[in-house]
């Protein structure tokens, strides 16, 4: 009996009630591998998800998120609200990054600035909301009588632009 | 003769979580799927999802996607389902039943006793 | 999702009285099974594919339908069918259930 079935290929199940005949998978079903005992049910792509590929009878519907969200898990098991660069989401809803963190993507969660003082260097930019610091040589290597091909550019305030 | 043995009641707190078993017997595991379904008091029956032991598929209603995950034990034909971030409205008896994998119909032919779920602070 | 109503709620019926329970389907569904559950117990498969009544199920029972609009039957009523009585469709997911007609005999 075992062998019948292993013969039912992709897109077909091996109908026990039917002497193990190989019967295509009914509408909304498929199968992806040979011998099955049952087609599976086809995932479907509602509400926030919409549909990147159709189900056929040999291989699942995918999911993609609909705008403004995006994909997490395994297929695109779940879709997350997206929020803008320099928040993150919260059971509230999309929050501004507090003050020394920061959030350069539409997802995930706001990360502390980098401690440049840890690697012994200075900070040559200012982080902001959306981007972390950007680190400098070190004040020693600042200091006068230290030799420096490029002058460090000056360190300038969150969210403002040189002159 | 087929049988599905469901776990014992449970009673949790708001925000916990709860798995809960159905072993089956008298035939064989992996030939047919597995559904769960819940059925809470003064409500209509619901579909929660499936899983096909066979290969560890799951298909589940979009309602439960975030909180129910579906997983079954072939070597001891144990099926499970576990249900998180639990509110009182998950209050009910959770089923298990299986459905005939070589079925189109996608019919519940035996289902389990039933596990009583009651979420109160 | 396909939503399956069933009427009437509640029946109340006399022995060897024929009843009929509808259920309708806001969408075209392929057929309809049917489940009776008593008070303190699990559903139990009763009758699939809109006509086939399950083992053990007494020959009074029927099913019948297509489409939108599908029935269940009892030909003489005795007081052991006295029930719930539920429908399910799964033409399109997720698999839906009717919320049941309660059956009581006098």
């Known amino acids: 009996l075992q062998d019948l079935c292993s013969n039912c290929p992709a897109g077909t199940f091996c109908d026990n009630n039917r002497s193990q005949i190989c019967s295509p998978c009914p509408p909304n079903s498929f199968s992806s591998a040979g011998g099955q005992r049952t087609c599976d049910i086809c995932r479907q792509c509602k509400g926030v998800f919409k549909t990147r590929k159709e189900c056929s009878s040999t291989s699942n519907a995918e999911c993609d998120c609909i705008s403004g969200y995006h994909c997490l898990g395994a297929e695109c098991s779940m879709c997350e609200q997206d929020c803008k660069q320099g928040q993150e989401l919260t059971k509230k809803g999309c929050k501004d990054c507090c003050f020394g963190t920061f959030n350069d993507q539409k997802r995930g969660i706001c990360r502390p600035w980098t401690n440049c003082s840890l690697d012994g260097k200075s900070v040559l930019v200012n982080g902001t909301k959306e981007r972390d610091v950007v680190c400098g040589p070190s004040p020693a290597d600042l200091s006068p009588g230290a030799s420096s091909a490029t002058p460090p550019a000056p360190a300038r305030e969150p969210g403002h632009s040189p002159q | 003769q087929v049988q599905l043995v469901q776990s014992g009641a449970e009673v949790k707190k708001p925000g916990a979580s709860v798995k809960m078993s159905c072993k089956a017997s008298?035939?064989?595991?992996?030939?047919?799927?597995m559904h769960w379904l819940k059925q809470a008091p003064g409500q209509c029956l619901e579909w929660i999802g499936y899983?096909?032991?066979?290969?560890?598929?799951?298909n589940y209603n979009q309602k439960f996607t975030d909180r129910a995950t579906l997983t079954a034990d072939k070597s001891t034909s144990t099926a499970y389902m576990e249900l998180s971030s639990l509110r009182s409205e998950d209050t009910a008896v959770y089923y298990c039943?299986?459905?005939?994998?070589?079925?189109?119909?996608?019919?519940?032919?035996?289902w389990g006793q039933g596990t009583t779920v009651t979420v109160s602070s | 999702e396909i939503v399956l109503t069933q009427s009437p709620d509640f029946q109340s019926a006399t022995p060897k009285e024929k009843v009929t329970i509808t259920c309708r389907a806001s969408?075209?569904?392929?057929?309809i099974h049917w489940y009776q559950q008593k008070p303190g117990s699990s559903p139990k498969a009763w009758i699939s594919a809109t006509s086939n009544l399950a083992s053990g199920v007494p020959s009074r029972f029927s099913g019948s339908g297509s489409g939108t609009s599908y029935t269940l039957t009892i030909n003489r009523v005795e007081a052991e069918d006295a029930a719930t009585y539920y429908c399910?469709?799964?033409?399109?997911?997720?698999?839906?259930f009717g919320c049941g007609t309660k059956l009581e005999i006098k």
């Open positions: 039943a299986r459905s005939d994998g070589s079925s189109s119909k996608w019919y519940f032919d035996v």
């Open positions: 899983i096909n032991p066979s290969s560890g598929y799951t």
């Open positions: 399910q469709q799964w033409s399109s997911n997720p698999f839906t």
């Open positions: 008298g035939y064989t595991f992996t030939f047919y799927t």
């Open positions: 969408s075209s569904v392929s057929y």
